[in-house]
Interface confidence: low
């Protein structure tokens, strides 16, 4: 994906079919890459991130990932192609409307990664258990 | 109920400026892109910009590219689009619009606003 | 820009007849097209999206097919209330241009 900064024109209005035939839009995410984040010990945390970007190809979805090691918590904010990997791990939520945080292993950090299919999905970041993707009334969600 | 009230039309004369409004209600308005869309008297439909839910991204045609700003206030769930450098091919009716998440209705426009006129004219 | 060509331009008919509308884009849109309602005085409907997707809400004697370039818009039998301007869409690539529209008149 091209970053913000440098992002060509891209068509806002182009759609593509997954598996399902589901028709998808380019996706509007968050996209601030790697920043440094105050979100500890919450249920939820705003991405705090100003920049919206459409995703370079209309199959990326957002990703948002959370890491916390002994000197500091980072929050990262990107599209990103749900058919390959992202961190070394597959994007197994990328057709959830929410950005569900998962613990992922990975060592000397705690490290958190959720993706989601909906507009700016990873401007917020749902670590609380109430939400858990095996909840069949999670994909009903159509944010109304 | 999803509701779309525009405001802020009327006369104006060329060169002049107008701040159209868009009051909504009946779903959550900060993550829902919208657009606005005009039409000319006795014409068709014609996309004039996007904006995105969180306000960051926008896109414009090329006919109002640099002379109309479109905006957002989610804390009061209202869509703005500011018109400069008026011009009478500018006369139409704006429609405030909502763009639908992808995996509901692909982004196409599911909810319209009743409109409001615009006459550019000397 | 991608042109969207609507034919015919109006057709008159009448209730319980089987209406058929054409749009052609002037390039490949693949499946991406909507087709709106619009009444005099008030604004668009949805009522078909992705080509042949029908908008909640909407009676099942619309229907759309088509891909590529060229897309149907039926109506198996026509109501009172159908009696309407219609516009089909494209929404391949930005800028989303319209159709110049199709008015259903009442014979």
């Known amino acids: 994906t091209i970053p913000p900064h440098v992002q060509k024109s891209v068509n806002n209005d182009m759609i593509v079919t997954d598996n399902n035939g589901a028709v998808k839009f380019p996706q509007l995410c968050k996209f601030c890459d790697v920043r440094f984040s105050t979100c500890d010990n919450q249920k939820s945390c705003m991405s705090n991130c100003s920049i919206t970007s459409i995703c370079e190809k209309p199959q990326e979805v957002c990703v948002a990932v959370w890491r916390k090691n002994d000197e500091n918590i980072t929050l990262e904010t990107v599209c990103h192609d749900p058919k390959l990997p992202y961190h070394d791990f597959i994007l197994e939520d990328a057709a959830s409307p929410k950005c569900i945080m998962k613990e992922k292993k990975k060592p000397g950090e705690t490290f958190f990664m959720c993706s989601c299919s909906s507009d700016e999905c990873n401007d917020n970041i749902i670590f609380s258990e109430e939400y858990n993707t095996s909840n069949p009334d999670l994909l009903l969600v159509i944010f109304q | 109920e999803v509701q779309l009230v525009e405001s802020g039309g009327g006369l104006v004369q060329p060169g002049g400026s107008l701040r159209l409004s868009c009051a909504a209600s009946?779903?959550?308005?900060?993550?829902?892109?919208m657009t606005w869309v005009r039409q000319a008297p006795g014409k068709g439909l014609e996309w004039v910009s996007v904006?995105?839910?969180?306000?960051?991204?926008?896109y414009y045609a090329d006919s109002v590219k640099g002379r109309f700003t479109i905006s957002r206030d989610n804390s009061k769930n209202t869509l703005y689009l500011q018109m400069n450098s008026l011009r009478a091919e500018d006369t139409a009716v704006y429609y405030c619009a909502r763009r639908g998440q992808y995996r509901d209705i692909v982004g196409a426009t599911d909810y319209w606003g009743q409109g409001t006129l615009v006459t550019v004219s000397s | 820009d991608i042109q969207m060509t609507q034919s015919p331009s109006s057709l008159s008919a009448s209730v319980g007849d089987r209406v058929t509308i054409t749009c052609r884009a002037s390039q490949s849109i693949s499946s991406y097209l909507n087709w709106y309602q619009q009444k005099p005085g008030k604004a668009p409907k949805l009522l078909i999206y992705a080509a042949s997707s029908l908008q909640s809400g909407v009676p099942s004697r619309f229907s759309g097919s088509g891909s590529g370039t060229d897309f149907t818009l039926t109506i198996s039998s026509l109501q009172p209330e159908d009696f309407a301007t219609y516009y089909c869409?494209?929404?391949?690539?930005?800028?989303?241009?319209f159709g110049q529209g199709t008015k259903v008149e009442i014979k």
């Open positions: 009946g779903f959550r308005f900060d993550i829902y892109a």
């Open positions: 869409q494209q929404s391949y690539s930005t800028p989303p241009t």
């Open positions: 904006i995105s839910g969180s306000g960051g991204t926008t």
